[in-house]
Amino acid sequence: AQEVQQSPHCTTVPVGASVNITCSTSGGLRGIYLRQLGPQPQDIIYYEDGVVPTTDRRFRGRIDFSGSQDNLTITMHRLQLSDTGTYTCQAITEVNVYGSGTLVLVTEEQSQGWHRCSDAPPRASALPAPPTGSALPDPQTASALPDPPAASALP
């Protein structure tokens, strides 16, 4: 089954610093989202090979990408206290799949010692339950769309 491997589980950084989040899959996806979880989950980026990434206004000018959609590293720069939260990757495939999440703790430099990540991954309760019937496309029509040709994503 398709999976999204996501790292790190947790990272603590001072205000103004950068953080890398890596989302890896076994391929066969249309694109990948990075979403900040919370009462109102918010899409941060959508990345697809050969296409200009879609980036939330709050992060424009603060995000870089390296790799490909199958093995993507997202670098968020100039972090602010309000960027603290859990970020999860969502791969758009025939079945929508989620990464385990990355807890990003942004701290005032002087208080960094007070806030540390444990080695445990974020609690499962922090992640959205995959919606029922979350196949893409619907399970009975999974073969309706062929894999997109590599060139079709190019502008």
Epitope: G31, Y46, G50, V51, I92, N96, G133, A153
Partner: nanobody
Framework: QVQLVESGGGLVKPGGSLRLSCAAS????????MGWYRQAPGKQRELVAD???????NYADPVKGRFTISRDNAKNSLYLQMNSLRAEDTAVYFC????????WGQGTLVTVSS
């Protein structure tokens, strides 16, 4: 979550054209990975075409070269231009945000008949 309302269906003769619209409410439409589905009488729902936030598109084999999916983020709208319609295109057409798997809309009926 994006709420969706489909429109633009109707009765058309074989070889004719129709343009379907899907109006979305919600502030994150530009991030939505949108698809058009259809369900013909007595058949299962199938994905016809989809479009990513980056505007890359994908089509089911039966509609390639005849249907065009597009979006207008400024208007929070999704479209399906259907040309060279055939009797087998008769179905109820639905749009959906493929990220979130929310409830289906009511759809819009397309009937291709002479």
């Amino acid at each position: 979550q994006v709420q969706l309302v489909e429109s633009g269906g109707g009765l058309v003769k074989p070889g004719g054209s129709l343009r379907l619209s899907c109006a979305a409410s919600g502030s994150s439409f530009h991030f939505a990975f949108m698809g058009w589905y259809r369900q013909a009488p007595g058949k299962q729902r199938e994905l016809v075409a989809d479009i990513s936030p980056g505007n890359s598109t994908n089509y089911a084999d039966p509609v390639k070269g005849r249907f065009t999916i597009s979006r207008d983020n400024a208007k929070n709208s999704l479209y399906l231009q259907m040309n060279s319609l055939r009797a087998e295109d008769t179905a109820v057409y639905f749009c959906r945000d493929l990220r979130s798997w929310g409830a289906w809309g009511q759809g819009t009926l397309v009937t291709v008949s002479s």
